[in-house]
């Protein structure tokens, strides 16, 4: 499978909410012994490999934000820790995987990465990730609502081993 990032750039005004999205493409094994681990984290530009560095999102680590579910299931973070930080990650039946960030501040600007791992009965088999940028703006130049910029098809379907 691949991970696509429908949008490579999100430009949002301070105080707004935003939902960053990744999408699983291609055949997804839904066998009973196959599960998926999905998470989000921050990273930085200028590395040899995008998303190799991992930073927390609002002090929450990739493990705090992770989802783990079967190939045929939907899931979302229900724990208080994420919600207290204005965060919620979710995954639906159609391969969409997202993180919602509420009440954005300038400190939320940066590079965000989603990670999806296919696990076949205890064994981590495939690891793929996607990257996107969030710019939070303030002042008269800021948009009134979030503006999203589509990825080029080449970028959005790029597979990168994490």
């Amino acid at each position: 499978f691949k991970v696509a990032t429908p949008y490579s750039l999100y430009v949002c005004p301070e105080g707004q909410n935003v939902t960053l999205t990744c999408r699983l493409l291609g055949p997804v094994d839904k066998g009973h012994d196959v599960t998926f681990y999905k998470t989000w984290y921050r990273s930085s530009r200028g590395e040899v490999q995008t998303c190799s560095e991992r930073r927390p999102i609002r002090n929450l680590t990739f493990q705090d934000l992770h989802l783990h579910h079967g190939g045929h299931q939907a899931a979302n973070t229900s724990h208080d820790l994420a919600q207290r930080h204005g965060l919620e990650s979710a995954s639906d039946h159609h391969g969409n995987f997202s993180i919602t960030m509420r009440n954005l501040t300038l400190l939320d600007s940066g590079l965000y990465c989603c990670l999806v791992v296919e696990i076949r009965h205890h064994h981590s088999e495939h690891r793929v990730h996607g990257a996107m940028e969030l710019q939070v703006q303030t002042g008269k130049d800021a948009p009134s609502n979030c503006v999203v910029y589509p990825s080029s098809s080449q970028d959005s379907e790029n597979i990168t081993a994490a």
Epitope: H32, Y37, Q63, H68, V117, I119, H122, R127
Partner: antibody, heavy 121, light 106 residues
């Protein structure tokens, strides 16, 4: 906080059976495998098998088929391992361990405190 | 069955020394996990997927390897590191542990 609490030590007669319990708290018990591990002095750690509480699905180390039987009760978040036809070779500390998926890698992330089973006439 | 052979069985080191223990697999593996066990206690998850430290593990520990050969290294041993270290594979049933390396501090 995840915790696995095992039942207390057992002194058993040869030929008898024993049932060890492992109560889980702090996570979704039904969704993660419970592993069972044997440790005899000087013998290291030996994987016996596993159960997925939500479905009741089990996998056994061939060596322990017929010796160990796993069950789980999702209403009490408790997993059980029964050992039958006990011999002195079954004298050991038995651990339950909870599968944790960390960074997309499953491993034995949570361990019970161990249950000592002694088989003696 | 994949057999994991750990060496040495016993390792004696002085505080501040660098030590390395190895784990060899009878078949090639994608990665290896390591656990630490102290006498009278349950094993603790220590290093996952060959080289990643579990939460709370001191940075003096590191792991490396690929294929059939893996190792755990402590850059500067401390007294609290005295324990037995086990490697473990979760690639094929039966899932197996190595025989352990007991680290003694002089």
């Amino acid at each position: 906080q995840v915790q696995l609490q095992q039942s207390g030590a057992e002194l058993m007669k040869p030929g008898a059976s024993v049932k060890i319990s492992c109560k889980a708290t702090g996570y979704t018990f039904s969704r993660y495998w419970i592993e069972w591990v044997k440790q005899r002095p000087g013998h290291g750690l030996e994987w016996i098998g596993e159960i997925l509480p939500g479905s009741g699905s089990t996998n056994y180390n061939e060596k322990f088929k017929g010796k160990a039987t796993f069950t789980a009760d999702t209403s009490s978040n408790t997993a059980y391992m029964q050992l039958s036809s006990l011999t002195s070779e079954d004298s050991a500390v038995y651990y339950c361990a909870g599968e944790e998926v960390y960074d997309g890698y499953p491993w034995f992330g949570y361990w019970g405190q161990g249950t000592l089973v002694t088989v003696s006439a | 069955q994949i057999v994991l052979s750990q060496s040495p069985a016993i390792l004696s080191a002085s505080p501040g020394e660098k030590v390395t223990m190895t784990c060899r697999a009878s078949s090639s593996l994608s990665y290896m996990h390591w656990y630490q066990q102290k006498p009278g206690s349950s094993p603790k998850p220590w290093i996952y997927a060959t080289s990643n430290l579990a939460s709370g593990v001191p940075a003096r520990f590191s792991g490396s390897g690929s294929g059939t050969s893996y190792s755990l290294t402590i850059s500067r041993v401390e007294a609290e590191d005295a324990a037995t270290y086990y490697c473990q594979q979760w690639s094929s049933n039966p899932y197996t542990f190595g025989g352990g390396t007991k680290l003694e501090i002089k």
